[in-house]
Interface confidence: low
């Protein structure tokens, strides 16, 4: 679809005559008829297949024709067509004299024709005007012409329809050749496809308008490149949506069970070694000099009051040393050179002779302790409460306030498997991931400390100089009954060579 445009510029008819040679009276009132048709090698009469147009009277005899397009007038003349421009044409321009106001062909005398020109040729679509001048014996006509495409039609033949649009069918303007030029943010042959946010994941993201990135189900993030893990996944990730792959050290369906409490929480203090022992469970192995569930307590070896009979304890780098009072000797001042005759029991303690008077034992009244009943009972000094339990003095007795998860007189039992006190004979129960373990006291063995085993402290023949060895079953220690002429805990000193006591 397009328009053939003809611009009449000047018509010269100096003598004011008709084609017949007869003069016009009073002058030649001139108008034009134009016929546009398909290409003919010899232009002949017949239908104006591409269209016709007529002008009003434009002047008399000789005149210039004003360009009237800006004022909505009829110059240039418009011959619209609704087909593909073939590139060739035939054009007939007739100049007529109008004696009256009626310009219809049937209203004019046949000899009113002033001149007739016919041209034919090739004409490409374009904005440039072709200038032409046709001269006959009596007249001259100067004119120009061109073919342009109608609005929304493009291409060499005005056959390409393109109408700019910005709706859901497309977002484009038209180039001079009729090709689409997408508006910013749109792409595709018909500019229907929005250009998503730069970096938006090709498969997992999409957009309905430019610079947008909407995630498909199971994906998230600004660029839809992060998968959404299973709902409730705590310490896990995904490589595809709705997965929950646990991070190192986590277990359970939703990766919410801590299998590496040691690494995640570092509970052991003072350089202790931490061992994972199940879900949220751990064991601290303390360095020498430390104690407590988390090895948080500094241990003085004298704290357990190892020196008996009023001996004073001195901490040393590799342990401790007991300074014994007169009448006592041994590693813990446990051996006495005294007898009941020396009234060694304090605070109303009653004395009992042992080993035929070689030594004695004090039976202390309530609230007193020590080999000689010399100590008032502080039942908490030995840190009897296990697993971080807090020791509380209650007059003559004591009690342990346990941390959550522990129970028993000394907080020695985990609440779970150890709750039913499975260890016999005072065995200590330990909760393990897959059960429990009993630590048996001296003299007992078996999975639940149910087997009594006698410990013979004399088995190692600790007594010298043919002394008689006795096992004290209450303390699992030995006592040497020295023959005449020898003294000492092992009868190792001959009488007359007294031991060199440190005081």
């Amino acid at each position: 679809s397009g328009v053939f445009q003809l611009q009449l510029q000047e018509f010269i008819n100096e003598r004011g005559v008709l084609a017949s040679g007869r003069p016009c009276e009073p002058g030649c009132r001139t108008f034009f008829r134009v016929c546009l048709k398909h290409f003919q090698a010899v232009v002949s009469p017949g239908p104006c297949t591409f269209g016709t147009v007529s002008t009003p009277v434009l002047g008399t005899n000789s005149f210039a024709v004003r360009d009237d397009s800006s004022g909505g007038g009829r110059n240039p003349l418009q011959l619209p067509f609704n087909f593909t421009w073939p590139g060739t044409f035939s054009l007939i321009i007739e100049a007529w004299h109008a004696p009256g106001d009626d310009l219809r062909p049937e209203a004019l005398p046949p000899d009113a024709l002033i001149s007739k020109i016919a041209i034919q040729g090739s004409l490409a679509v374009g904005q440039n005007w072709l200038l032409d001048e046709q001269t006959s014996t009596l007249t001259r006509l100067r004119y120009s012409y061109r073919v342009i495409c109608s609005d929304n039609y493009y291409g060499d033949n005005c056959s390409r329809l393109c109408k700019k649009r910005n709706d859901h069918f497309g977002h484009y303007v038209c180039q001079p050749d009729g090709n689409l030029s997408c508006l910013p943010g749109w792409t595709g042959e018909y500019c229907q496809q929005p250009i998503c946010l730069s970096g938006c994941h090709e498969q997992n993201g999409y957009c309905s308008k430019p610079a947008e990135c909407l995630c498909r189900p199971g994906w998230q993030g600004r660029l839809c490149n992060e998968c959404i893990p299973h709902n409730g996944c705590r310490h896990g990730t995904c490589s595809t949506p709705w997965q929950c792959t646990c991070d190192e050290g986590w277990g359970g369906l939703f990766c919410d069970q801590d299998l590496n409490y040691c690494t995640h929480h570092s509970p052991c203090k003072n350089g202790a070694t931490c061992s994972n022992s199940g879900q949220r469970s751990y064991t601290c192995t303390c360095r020498p000099g430390y104690t407590g569930v988390d090895c948080e307590l500094e241990l003085s070896e004298c704290d357990s009051n190892p020196c008996r009979n009023g001996g004073s304890c001195k901490d040393q780098e590799d342990g401790y040393h007991c300074l014994c009072p007169p009448g006592y000797y041994g590693l813990h001042c446990e051996h006495s050179t005294l007898s009941c005759a020396d009234s060694p029991c304090f605070n109303g303690g009653s004395c009992r002779e042992r080993n035929q008077g070689a030594n004695y034992a004090c039976e202390c009244p309530p609230n007193f302790t020590g080999s000689n009943c010399e100590k008032k009972v502080d039942r908490c000094t030995s840190n009897p409460c296990a697993n971080g339990g807090q020791c509380l003095n209650r007059g003559p007795s004591r009690m342990c306030r346990c941390r959550p998860g522990f129970t028993g007189t000394y907080c020695e039992l985990h609440v779970s498997d150890c709750a039913r006190n499975p260890c016999a004979h005072g065995g200590t129960c330990h909760d393990l991931e897959n059960g429990l373990m009993c630590t048996c006291p001296a003299g007992f063995s078996g999975r639940r400390c149910e087997v009594r085993t006698s410990i013979d402290a004399c088995a190692s023949s600790p007594c010298f100089n043919r002394a008689t060895c006795y096992t004290d079953l209450s303390t699992d220690t030995f006592v040497c009954n020295c023959p005449y002429g020898f003294v000492g805990s092992r009868c190792e000193f001959p009488v007359g060579l007294p031991p060199s006591f440190p005081w």
């Epitope: 329809l161 859901h168 069918f169 497309g170 595709g188 042959e189 018909y190 229907q192």
Partner: nanobody, 120 residues
Framework: EVQLVESGGGLVQAGGSLRLSCAVS????????IGWFRQAPGKEPEGISC????????YYADSVKGRFTISRDNAKNTVYLQMNSLKPEDTAVYYC?????????????TGQGTQVTVSS
């Protein structure tokens, strides 16, 4: 509101024929290409035929070429798909669609579909 309504589906024996119709409303029918695609259960959709706005350009998938014919009646705002020599593998839901442009490029609107079942 753009609407494409398919009809003419049904049960037919192998070797038989059906004629599907697609009645269009809600936009300028003359300006847009109309096509047909089908989707069998568990399979990807398959574009089978399309006709340009002018009716001058038609397209057929290899699987239906020579057996199916597409045509349009611009006066009735209707597109037809004549299906001959039907095979069991033609069983699917058939959808009428338009790209919203004159040429057969993409899909913008589709109908609800009509079931075609070819028994052996």
């Amino acid at each position: 509101e753009v609407q494409l309504v398919e009809s003419g589906g049904g049960l037919v024996q192998a070797g038989g024929s059906l004629r599907l119709s697609c009645a269009v409303s809600g936009f300028s029918f003359d300006d847009y290409a109309i096509g047909w695609f089908r989707q069998a259960p568990g399979k990807e959709p398959e574009g089978i035929s399309c006709i340009s706005s002018s009716g001058g350009i038609t397209y057929y998938a290899d699987s239906v070429k020579g057996r199916f014919t597409i045509s349009r009646d611009n006066a009735k705002n209707t597109v037809y798909l004549q299906m001959n020599s039907l095979k069991p593998e033609d069983t699917a839901v058939y959808y009428c669609a338009t790209p919203g442009i004159a040429a057969c490029r993409g899909i913008h609107y589709t109908g609800q579909g009509t079931q075609v079942t070819v028994s052996s």
